[in-house]
């Protein structure tokens, strides 16, 4: 029995509901009775949904998947998954059983988009040129790990003396902190682009630094 | 070819704990799960629960989840149950089996068998 | 649990006998079956697996048929090695379970 499932991962945002399509051919005279369907994380085996004995069987998985029960006799047994999250994220297998078997994978990529980053300056005045001074772009509740560039306003990038760290919080989300040293000159502007590798979404954030001019005693 | 090695017999008294091994060879450890299943006596297959050498994660039988420990070390290609408090109904052949079959069926299917281990429980 | 129940128990037949062995699962388990044979003091060996499939190496003259609750073992013609205990198991469900059994005697 031929079991299909899209090849490519299903990204899904988190909180939305996300459709893991598996579809197989019935033959002429398939009654739902004959059919058992079981939908699992590949990983570990966990259960996540079931339809046996011409009955949905339910969900065993946090009661946020449901199969399209008027689509079943028609070959389509994909499992809606509700209100996604990050801990969600990963292969579920699709296993059909009428009189022959068959199995696919299907991976589930989680996302969530990057907010817009807050830029902080330190020190934050009495600034002068020469000065070295740290620069803060922060992000927040964004998965998967974001890539962080900084460049100046030539649009030149900036790699060295930059310092990345990104923390999940108890959602599994990321909050970015990048921090540039950089020796100020007469006058500046200084970016930051955090990227979302999955969703291909850049934020943007940036700071112009007007220098004061030098003064000699 | 696949081949797994289980360790020698063990006579145990009731209450004692005793740890199996099982050397796998013939195939990448962590891409079969491996299997504990047991034979009484006269009786019929028991299955005691699996690993996934690739992550680490167990499935066990709820008959012997308090009592059962299934671990591996990758580095080794070897996989360890550990049964504790023993009673003499655990007097059985001991067997470590891997599942090549995987996702063919939703649990699995018992391909590749050690030759067994008896263990006695006997005071 | 899901149990599983085999009949005969123990059957006697001749070489060249044609056998028949019966599984019952206590429910539906679609075609999530396998079945084993088990010589004295060896390991069992898988024979089908999803009720009906022969595993690699398997002679012909084993086949096998059922879904949902009833399955059944066929030995089309008995070869003397084919004396055996043998075992169903359903792949379903944990805790993976198997039949009592059924022993092939020689008449």
């Known amino acids: 029995l031929e079991v299909q499932v899209p090849e490519d991962p299903v990204v899904a945002l988190v909180g939305t509901d996300a459709t893991l399509c598996c579809s197989f051919s019935p033959e002429p005279g398939f009654s739902l009775a004959q059919l058992n369907l079981i939908w699992q994380l590949t990983d570990t085996k966990q259960l996540v949904h079931s339809f046996a004995e011409g009955q949905d069987q339910g969900s065993a998985y946090a009661n946020r998947t449901a199969l399209f029960p008027d689509l079943l006799a028609q070959g389509n047994a994909s499992l809606r998954l509700q209100r996604v999250r990050v801990a969600d994220e990963g292969s579920f297998t699709c296993f059909v059983s009428i009189r022959d078997f068959g199995s696919a994978a299907v991976s589930l990529q989680v996302a969530a988009p990057y907010s817009k980053p807050s830029m902080t300056l330190e020190p934050n005045k009495d600034l002068r040129p020469g000065d070295t001074v740290t620069i803060t772009c922060s992000s927040y509740r964004g998965y998967p790990e974001a890539e962080v560039f900084w460049q100046d306003g030539q649009g030149v990038p900036l790699t060295g003396n930059v310092t990345t760290s990104q923390m999940a919080n108890e959602q599994g989300l990321f909050d970015v902190h990048s921090v540039l040293r950089v020796v100020l000159g007469a006058n500046g502007t200084y970016s930051c682009l955090v990227r979302n590798p999955v969703l291909q979404q850049d934020a943007h954030g940036s700071v112009t630094i007007t220098g004061q001019p030098m003064t000699f005693p | 070819q696949v081949q797994l090695v289980e360790s020698g017999a063990e006579v145990k008294k009731p209450g004692a704990s005793v740890k199996l091994s099982c050397k796998a060879s013939?195939?990448?450890?962590?891409?079969?799960?491996m299997h504990w299943v047991r034979q009484a006596p006269g009786q019929r297959l028991e299955w005691m629960g699996e690993?996934?050498?690739?992550?680490?994660?167990?499935n066990y039988n709820e008959k012997f989840k308090s009592r059962v420990t299934i671990t591996v070390d990758k580095s080794a290609s070897t996989a360890y149950m550990e049964l504790s408090s023993l009673r003499s109904e655990d007097t059985a052949v001991y067997y470590c089996?891997?599942?090549?079959?995987?996702?063919?069926?939703?649990?699995?299917?018992?391909?590749?068998w050690g030759q067994g281990t008896l263990v006695t429980v006997s005071s | 649990d899901i149990q599983m129940t085999q009949s005969p128990s123990s059957v006697s037949a001749s070489v060249g006998d044609r056998v028949t062995i019966s599984c019952r699962a206590s429910?539906?388990?679609?075609?999530?079956l396998a079945w084993y044979q088990q010589k004295p003091g060896k390991a069992p060996r898988l024979l089908i697996y999803?009720?009906?499939s022969l595993d690699s190496g398997v002679p012909s003259r084993f086949s096998a048929s059922g879904s949902g609750t009833d399955f059944t073992l066929t030995i089309s013609s008995l070869q003397p090695e084919d004396f055996a205990t043998y075992y169903c198991q359903q792949a379903i469900n944990f805790p993976i379970t198997f039949g009592q059994g059924t022993r092939l005697e020689i008449k």
């Open positions: 690993i996934n050498p690739g992550n680490g994660h167990t």
């Open positions: 999803a009720a009906s």
């Open positions: 013939g195939y990448t450890f962590s891409s079969y799960w």
């Open positions: 429910q539906g388990i679609g075609t999530w």
């Open positions: 089996v891997a599942d090549p079959r995987r996702p063919k069926v939703p649990t699995a299917l018992f391909v590749y």
